[in-house]
């Protein structure tokens, strides 16, 4: 029954990182003319028959993985890519520092370190303007984020979050921003 219908897109506006009590809208977008959508929250057995889910105030219980599909005739589309909706501000903010310092020469190395007083085992580093976290292959969840051979593209404002692998969609508040300055470019 699941045929060649292309998968829809699912996005969170303004962002999939949502501070507690702040609004967010999940929007499922399929081809023109489609009006039968199903938006599911995974690992909760629940779904709604609308393309748009407006959350006026983010709650912990709404954090998690979402997916959507649409129906055309009797055929279901392929499912959208999963969207991970994260509630932030659940825990106190970590601190973010740069070693050896926030000013680094082009071509040099710098390590951004995220530290927290709590026993969290997961950390995510975001650069302002980038939608996805800064990931080191297989190791993005570590507290240290080494940046090797810095270029001008690495300059900007960074923030980090801490969370637990037991509750991967409940994150801390963001750290205070750290401005990374690349000199000699």
């Amino acid at each position: 029954q699941s045929g060649p219908l292309p998968k829809p897109s699912l996005q969170a506006l303004p962002s999939s990182l949502v501070p507690l009590e702040k609004p967010v809208t999940l929007r499922c977008q399929g081809p023109p003319g489609v009006d039968l959508y199903r938006l599911e929250k995974l690992s909760s057995s629940r779904y709604q028959d609308q393309a748009v889910l407006f959350i006026p105030a983010m709650k912990r219980s709404l954090a998690g993985r979402y997916r959507c599909s649409y129906q055309n005739g009797s055929l279901w589309s392929l499912p959208s890519d999963q969207l991970e909706l994260v509630a932030t501000g659940v825990f106190a903010k970590p601190s973010l520092s740069a070693q050896p310092g926030p000013a680094v020469s082009s071509g040099g190395d710098v390590t951004l370190q995220c530290q927290t007083r709590y026993g969290f085992d997961q950390f995510a580093l975001y650069k302002e303007g980038d939608p996805a976290p800064y990931k080191n292959p297989e190791r993005w969840y570590r507290a240290s984020f080494p940046i090797i051979t810095v270029t001008a593209a690495h300059s900007g404002t960074y923030r980090c979050y801490s969370f637990s692998s037991r509750d991967p969609y409940l994150w801390s508040a963001p750290s205070d921003p750290l401005e990374l300055v690349v000199t000699g470019t």
Epitope: Q1, L42, Q48, D49, R67
Partner: antibody
Framework: QVQLVESGGGLVKPGGSLRLSCAAS????????MSWIRQAPGKGLEWVSS????????DYAASVKGRFTISRDNAKNSLYLQMNSLRAEDTAVYYC????????????????WGQGTLVTVSS | QSVLTQPPSVSGAPGQRVTISCTGS?????????VHWYQQLPGTAPKLLIY???NRPSGVPDRFSGSKSGTSASLAITGLQAEDEADYYC???????????FGGGTKLTVLG
């Protein structure tokens, strides 16, 4: 309290037709997805078809697609299953079941079932 | 053949603990869908026993518990009683065509 009462079962010849009804009471029928689930004698449960709360989303098991038609009348608090081109393997007790709902969310499980109506397809 | 696989039968003496397994695939249980369990006493309609992998509706004794891991789930019954003798079915949802799927059912016999 929630009540689901099926009717319309009986003996029918292969190739024949039958229309099952499910009368719902004790809850806001138009808010809930509804399904038909069947159980052949001595066998397990088999989901047959479901319909969305507004009658828009409709799904069928592959075994009945093209032969059975699910519908609902929210004004009458009733669910229906029109069964055409019946086969011996359609012989079963047919249950009407309600899907759980909470606030804006529907759920993928059945919280209330009727007592069932027996459909026998035999020459 | 059922989409979800259950053992046809299990048995135990009164007071014992029994478990019933339910194995699915990456398109149903493994796709993020929960598992639900129903109890069908002889001659009656099925009744919801466990929803959302491990939650009990009001009125269901805490002797019944459920869990899920990966592409499978299990139902545990402790302190087995004669009135637990029934058929038990697991149920989930399948992403392929958005259909509801059941296990083949497990007949629980209370010995003695």
């Amino acid at each position: 309290q929630v009540q689901l009462v099926e009717s319309g079962g009986g003996l029918v010849k292969p190739g024949g037709s039958l229309r099952l009804s499910c009368a719902a009471s004790g809850f806001s029928f138009s808010d809930h997805y509804m399904s038909w689930i069947r159980q052949a004698p001595g066998k397990g449960l088999e989901w047959v078809s479901s319909v969305g709360s507004e009658g828009k989303f409709i799904d069928y098991a592959a075994s009945v697609k093209g032969r059975f038609t699910i519908s609902r009348d929210n004004a009458k608090n009733s669910l229906y299953l029109q069964m055409n081109s019946l086969r011996a393997e359609d012989t079963a007790v047919y249950y009407c079941a309600r899907h759980y709902r909470e606030f804006r969310w529907h759920y993928y499980y059945f919280d209330y079932w009727g007592q069932g109506t027996l459909v026998t397809v035999s020459s | 053949q059922s989409v979800l696989t259950q053992p046809p039968s299990v048995s135990g003496a009164p007071g014992q603990r029994v478990t019933i397994s339910c194995t699915g695939s990456s398109s149903n249980i493994g796709a993020g869908y929960d598992v639900h369990w129903y109890q069908q006493l002889p001659g009656t309609a099925p009744k919801l026993l466990i929803y959302g992998n491990s939650n009990r509706p009001s009125g269901v004794p805490d002797r019944f518990s459920g869990s899920k891991s990966g592409t499978s789930a299990s139902l545990a019954i402790t302190g087995l009683q004669a009135e637990d003798e029934a058929d038990y079915y697991c149920q989930s949802h399948d992403l392929g065509a958005h259909v509801w799927v059941f296990g083949g059912g497990t007949k629980l016999t209370v010995l003695g």
